[in-house]
């Protein structure tokens, strides 16, 4: 064993998604000679770790190297073991995190400094564990999915690599629905970027790209559920809330400090005259609508349009690749399909949420209570984001297609993170030799 | 031929210091992680710590029987591989191998002859 | 961490026996186990990494298998020179421990 094992023609990267509900685990690889090639770096496992987001150890610091292990372990089946030490670890922590550094920056730095120090002790070569912000988040996003649809290569193909790719090199735009956030990239059509927070420019492959990209910190589908609660149990008379986005005959008991916990429903808190209220679910679409839009300030815009608290969006432009929440709760209620129109979206979600939780338990034995009882909200708030939010229209709509899953990569921050931290995405077009020609076969 | 000579051992007081080092010789030394193993009198094998490269922060890891007293270091453009230790307790006392692994990681296929530590008043 | 605990403490053999040594670690490390002859006044020597795979100008007599919890080194036909201390290593996880040892003597 005298001398180190000839590395493998192929590479690895791994990349932590700590998100605010979750943490996953996602192990790339790629032709070692080919890391300037657009489209070579792909996907090969995915490991959800089990247990909450990082930002709920707070107080238990101590059990995060345990709650990594699997994931970790996982990765060092995979990953050959020659490549272990030249394999690049990555963490990013997304609103979660910056949820709890609003709250305390001594707790998100412990919380960070207990993860590293846990990845540090594996036989890869950490790289670093940090909260990236709603912009990188954004950016990164849109980075992945136009990168595996093969929008950044110069080569204009005459077949599809995906069902929705279209030949031409226009990019598609991202939506992004998380836990506690929520992320919109796109490159507007010759409009100006009116607010500078929003404004992002590439040079990628040898092209220009002027991107407009925003977070809104507390729209994620979990912080949007809390808020609405928050809000709506202001005005209820007793403890007794009767929610239109829960099932008919749902029932479920809701502990205040737990609602005022998160800064995202610091704006509608007040002291009420009880610790627990219970939500008793009336299961109506139309009013689920009505107050999520209450969540919505639209009546404040300093600029020449907004989405809504007054933050700027320029008109809409191309097709938008939505992924994360949009595509795992519209995949659950079956709303994915090219096909199906907004109005049949709209339909099909009030007669979902009409149904009663006896029965949608029963339909769904399989799933979680948790997570089962949450799709009404999830799907009502997914269509009234869109909609009024983002001021998608019932003809724009078939311009969003739900991505999972493209080439067998999960469409997400992660990948277009991992390509930059590793200068896989070169700023100018690779220059062809004749070796090369072998890619495009 | 692939080496490691350690030196800097001797007699030193509970609660003294002494630095010990690692001259490398005959592999690339900056792009291996290096160890410390230690051997007190009769006894088994004890890992010290490792560092690893500049690539990784030169990251360090200690046995928990010296964290926060012995520190590892290395210099790759002398390579060479340091072991500072600090208050010094009678049970550091030992041979002290300077080790590393030139193919994959965590076992050791090139040791050093060793250098011994005494701590004793 | 991982505790690694050798059996026996001390084997008494002829030259020529087959002998087997055993090493049990306190959880699973898959086959990330690695076997050390020494010798008085010498450092370790790697015998076998990865529970089994052997090295380069080691003799063949020299064999591991095992994986998960359990680890064995035989030594097929023991021969004069192979009468030391035998140490085998957990390399799965951080802190690297360890056996104690098995002194391999002549009975």
């Known amino acids: 064993t005298q001398n180190k094992a000839l590395p493998e023609n192929v590479k690895y990267g791994i990349v932590l998604d700590a998100g605010s509900s979750h943490t996953s685990l996602y192990i790339y690889k790629w032709p070692a000679e080919k890391e300037n090639d657009t489209g070579v770096v792909h996907q090969v496992e995915e490991c959800r770790v089990k247990g909450p987001g990082i930002s709920k150890f707070v107080q238990k610091v101590n059990e995060i190297g345990i709650y990594l292990t699997d994931c970790m372990e996982r990765a060092r089946e995979v990953i050959p073991r020659s490549q272990h030490q030249e394999t690049p670890v990555y963490l990013g922590a997304t609103a979660g995190m910056r949820l709890l550094r609003m709250e305390s920056e001594e707790l998100a730095d412990r919380v960070l400094d207990v993860v590293e120090r846990s990845l540090s002790n594996y036989p890869f070569d950490f790289q670093g564990a940090r909260i990236i912000t709603g912009q990188e988040e954004g950016a990164y996003g849109w980075i992945t999915i136009n990168y595996l649809l093969g929008k950044f290569s110069q080569k204009t193909r005459w077949f599809s690599i995906v069902p929705y790719e279209t030949n031409n090199q226009e990019t598609f735009g991202a939506l992004d629905l998380g836990g506690a956030s929520t992320q919109v990239t796109f490159v507007p059509q010759n409009q100006t970027i009116e607010s500078p927070d929003n404004a992002l420019q590439f040079r990628l492959y040898g092209k220009d790209y002027n991107v407009y990209t925003h977070s809104f910190l507390c729209y994620g589908k979990d912080q949007a559920l809390w808020q609405k609660l928050a809000k709506d149990i202001q005005v209820a008379s007793n403890e007794i809330l009767r929610d239109p986005c829960f099932h008919p005959g749902y029932k479920k008991v809701v502990n205040v400090s737990d609602l005022y916990k998160t800064p995202c429903t610091k704006r509608f808190e007040m002291t009420l005259p009880f610790q627990q209220f219970e939500i008793q679910g009336i299961g109506n679409y139309q009013q689920c609508h009505q107050s999520i839009l209450e969540l919505f300030n639209t009546s404040y815009c300093p600029y020449s349009q907004c989405a809504f608290n007054g933050i700027f969006l320029p008109p809409l432009q191309g097709d938008f690749g939505a992924f994360s929440a949009f595509y795992f709760v519209m995949k659950f209620l079956n709303l994915t399909s090219e096909k199906v129109s907004q109005e049949k979206v709209t339909e099909m979600m009030k007669k979902f949420c009409a149904q009663p939780w006896e029965e949608i338990k029963t339909s769904y034995a399989g799933v979680k209570e948790k997570y089962l009882s949450e799709y009404c909200f999830s799907g009502t708030y997914i269509l009234s984001l869109l909609l009024q939010g983002y001021h998608f229209t019932a003809d724009s709509w078939e311009h969003i297609h739900f991505i999972g899953k493209i080439q067998g990569s999960d469409a997400g921050w992660t990948l277009g993170y991992m390509l930059n931290l590793t200068n896989m995405i070169p700023a100018e077009q690779p220059l062809s030799t004749p070796l090369s020609h072998s890619t495009y076969v | 031929e692939v080496q490691l000579v350690e030196s800097g051992g001797g007699l030193v007081k509970p609660g003294g210091s002494l630095r010990l080092s690692c001259a490398a010789s005959g592999f690339t030394f900056s792009k291996y992680w290096m160890n410390w193993v230690r051997q007190a009198p009769g006894k088994g094998l004890e890992w010290v710590g490792e560092i690893r490269l500049k690539s990784n922060k030169y990251g360090t890891h200690y046995a928990e029987s010296v964290k926060g007293r012995f520190t590892i270091s290395r210099d790759d453009s002398k390579n060479t591989l340091y072991l500072q230790m600090n208050s010094l307790k009678t049970e550091d006392t030992a041979v002290y191998y300077c080790t590393t692994q030139l193919d994959l990681y965590w076992f050791f296929d090139v040791w050093g002859q060793g250098t011994t530590v005494t701590v004793s008043s | 961490e991982i505790v690694m605990t050798q059996s026996p403490a001390t084997l008494s053999v002829s030259p020529g026996e087959r002998v087997t040594l055993s090493c049990r670690a306190s959880?699973?490390?898959?086959?990330?186990l690695h076997w050390y002859q020494q010798k008085p006044g010498q450092s370790p020597r790697l015998l076998i990494y990865y529970a089994s795979q052997s090295i380069s100008g080691i003799p063949a007599r020299f064999s591991g298998s095992g994986s998960g919890t359990d680890f064995t080194l035989t030594i097929s036909s023991v021969e004069p020179e192979d009468f030391a201390v035998y140490f085998c290593q957990n390399g799965h996880s951080l802190p690297l421990t360890f056996g104690g040892g098995t002194k391999l003597e002549i009975k």
């Open positions: 959880q699973s490390i898959s086959d990330y």
